[in-house]
């Protein structure tokens, strides 16, 4: 069966939107009005992995781009990157480990934990216009909570 996907945007709990910053990086900043069109639209795919009521394994691709968020070790540190893939082969039900995030729903907020690096989360900074990154702390200065807005295909 083909993998099930939906299109969405994400905003952090401070209402910052995610936009492209160069070819292989996302940044978070406040957008208003027509600028909202700059925000990236994700194709969220529901992939194979350990699942529970509040935890669902997903892959986060950029809609109509052959780019996926992936988590790899760089200089011994878990790192978030945008990785290009062959569009003929993706998305797929069995994604490589580095592409898988556990989408965790808590109090109407979403967290995205790396399946490859447990307790590391997609994060944004309090500051404006900073890169989206993989953070190893929750409940500190950095933001790990998001809301999801559905986008029609």
């Amino acid at each position: 069966a083909p993998v099930r996907s939906l299109n969405c945007t994400l905003r952090d709990s401070q209402q910052k939107s995610l936009v492209m910053s160069g070819p292989y990086e996302l940044k978070a900043l406040h957008l208003q009005g027509q600028d909202m069109e700059q925000q990236v639209v994700f194709s969220m795919s529901f992939v194979q992995g350990e699942e529970s009521n509040d935890k669902i394994p997903v892959a986060l691709g950029l809609k109509e781009k052959n780019l996926y968020l992936s988590c790899v070790l760089k200089d011994d540190k878990p790192t978030l990157q945008l990785e290009s893939v062959d569009p003929k082969n993706y998305p797929k039900k069995k994604m490589e480990k580095r592409f898988v995030f556990n989408k965790i729903e808590i109090n109407n907020k979403l967290e995205f934990e790396s399946a490859q690096f447990p307790n590391w989360y997609i994060s944004t900074s309090q500051a404006e216009n900073m890169p989206v990154f993989l953070g190893g702390t929750k409940g500190g200065q950095d933001i790990t909570d998001f809301t999801m807005q559905f986008v029609s295909s």
Epitope: E50, D86, F117
Partner: antibody, heavy 120, light 107 residues
């Protein structure tokens, strides 16, 4: 230091089953990011990745063995298994187990291998 | 599946020679490439990972380079113990695939 030792190989008839074991020491397969794979080498041929299991139980298989082979682990025994059913002549090979950490995989430590011969 | 091609199946060289072994992927593998050495009766050894990173304990005469689809293993000055078979492995996409191997023989 890390050691991996394969066992369970032998001569088996086509269609029959065999279970290989990979006993390891020097690391724990409950450590996050850890993985063990099975790789085989047919006589006089190159290496072929067969199956892999991550610390969290996530499994992957080569198309050539999907539905016939099953990889599993027993953390308390520090052992990874490869259950091979419906064996075919083309499964004849030396089977190695190897350890990696994280995806993308680099197989850091390898066992010496165990020979499986499928023949009537 | 991604095909990995080591176009030279065997290579003759002498001690002290500089040797390069190549591996070509059927698509871009994002530098997710490792190199292995195999000797008869010995455990396979990891030499290079992530295209160019030298695994601990591997002599510095071994080096790796490449990007996209084309990758190279170089031995700067061949030693007696380097005569072996060398394999590349791509980790970009499941199923992970090896090259067919290049056997390095004494000239």
């Amino acid at each position: 230091q890390v050691q991996l030792v394969e066992s369970g190989g032998g001569v088996v008839q086509p269609g029959r089953s065999l279970r290989l074991s990979c006993a390891f020491s020097g690391f724990s397969l409950s450590t996050s990011g850890m993985g063990v794979g099975w790789i085989r080498q047919a006589p006089g041929k190159g290496l072929e990745w067969v199956a892999h299991i991550w610390w969290d139980g996530d499994e992957s298989y080569a198309d050539s063995v999907k539905g016939r082979f099953t990889i599993s682990k027993d953390n308390s025994k520090n052992t990874v298994y490869l259950q091979m059913n419906s064996l075919r002549a083309e499964d004849t090979a030396v089977y190695f187990c190897a350890r990696n950490r994280y995806d993308p995989p680099w197989f850091v430590d390898w066992g010496q291998g165990t020979l499986v011969t499928v023949s009537s | 599946d991604i095909q990995m091609t080591q176009s030279t199946s065997s290579l003759s060289a002498s001690v002290g020679d500089r040797v390069t072994i190549t591996c070509r992927a059927s698509q871009d593998i994002s530098n997710y490439l490792s190199w292995y050495q195999q000797k008869p009766g010995k455990a396979v050894k990891l030499l290079i990972y992530y295209t160019s990173k030298l695994h601990s304990g591997v002599p510095s005469r071994f080096s790796g380079s490449g990007s996209g689809t084309d990758y190279t293993l170089t031995i700067s000055s061949l030693q007696q113990e380097d005569f072996a078979t060398y394999f590349c492995l791509q980790g970009k996409m499941l199923p992970w695939t090896f090259g067919q191997g290049t056997k390095l023989e004494i000239k």
